[in-house]
């Protein structure tokens, strides 16, 4: 029997300082190139190697963006919300949606660890 | 894994056309950005045009109404077409991929880019 996979979804406020070259991540999504399907919402492709966000250490790559600066990234075209990143300013808050893969394990199957209830 | 093939350069007259390709493999060009770079003996690399996840195209201001960039996603193959060569066109190009857009630059920066070519040498003489 094959196991089930479920999604852990979190959301997060990170703060970060824009570095000498800039925020240093990448971004796909938006409502011209939608990345996930039926979902227009801007993802974080790639964290540039010792670039702001990576150093940080929080935004990961497939995280979805909700906000930037508190302005809601919905219904954007793919450049408006590069535009809204490249003059969100030195200080830069997002909003953020984590989805973390959780596998479960076959029906009626406890895994190591799991309360025995 | 990630590969790109560059192909097309040559000897051209000064005036002349050439049509530079860059193939692709491991994986699909619709969500990359895709730029065409050059090096010059004894120069630095620089950018010459490039093209966004979205087909926006970009040109440095030296060869802009002479270089077309272009790209075929079901062919996995992007193009730089070059028209009135001049012996300053002289260089290796390279192209580039990198994976969505950049929040911080356009992708004539070529710090933003992970993934290279070998390059192909183009000479106008």
């Known amino acids: 029997m094959n196991g089930r996979v479920d999604y852990l979804v979190t959301e997060e406020e990170i703060n970060l300082t824009r570095g000498p070259s800039g925020l240093g991540f990448n971004i796909v999504g938006g409502t011209d190139q939608q990345y996930v399907s039926n979902d227009s919402g801007i993802y974080v492709s790639r964290i540039k190697e010792n670039g702001a966000a990576a150093l940080d250490g929080r935004l990961q790559e497939g995280d979805k963006i909700l906000s930037v600066n508190g302005q809601d990234l919905k219904n954007l075209l793919h450049q408006d919300a590069v535009d809204l990143f490249r003059n969100a300013g030195y200080a830069v808050s997002l909003r953020v949606q984590h989805r973390l893969q959780v596998q479960n394990g076959p029906i009626g199957h406890r895994g190591e660890g799991d309360p025995s209830g | 894994q990630v590969q790109l093939v560059e192909s097309g350069g040559g000897l051209v007259q000064p005036g002349g056309s050439v049509r530079v390709s860059c193939v692709s493999s491991?994986?699909?060009?619709?969500?990359?950005?895709i730029g065409w770079f050059r090096q010059a003996p004894g120069k630095e690399r620089e950018g010459v045009s490039c093209?966004?996840?979205?087909?926006?195209?970009y040109y440095v201001d030296s060869v802009k109404g002479r270089f077309t960039i272009s790209r075929d996603n079901a062919k996995n193959t992007v193009y730089l077409q070059m028209n009135s060569l001049k012996p300053e066109d002289t260089a290796v190009y390279y192209c580039?991929?990198?994976?969505?857009?950049?929040?911080?630059?356009?992708?004539?920066?070529?710090?933003?880019?992970?993934?290279w070519g070998q390059g192909t040498q183009v000479t106008v003489s």
């Open positions: 093209i966004d996840s979205v087909g926006r195209a």
């Open positions: 580039a991929a990198d994976f969505g857009s950049s929040v911080d630059s356009t992708c004539l920066n070529n710090r933003q880019y992970d993934y």
């Open positions: 491991g994986f699909i060009l619709d969500y990359y950005a």
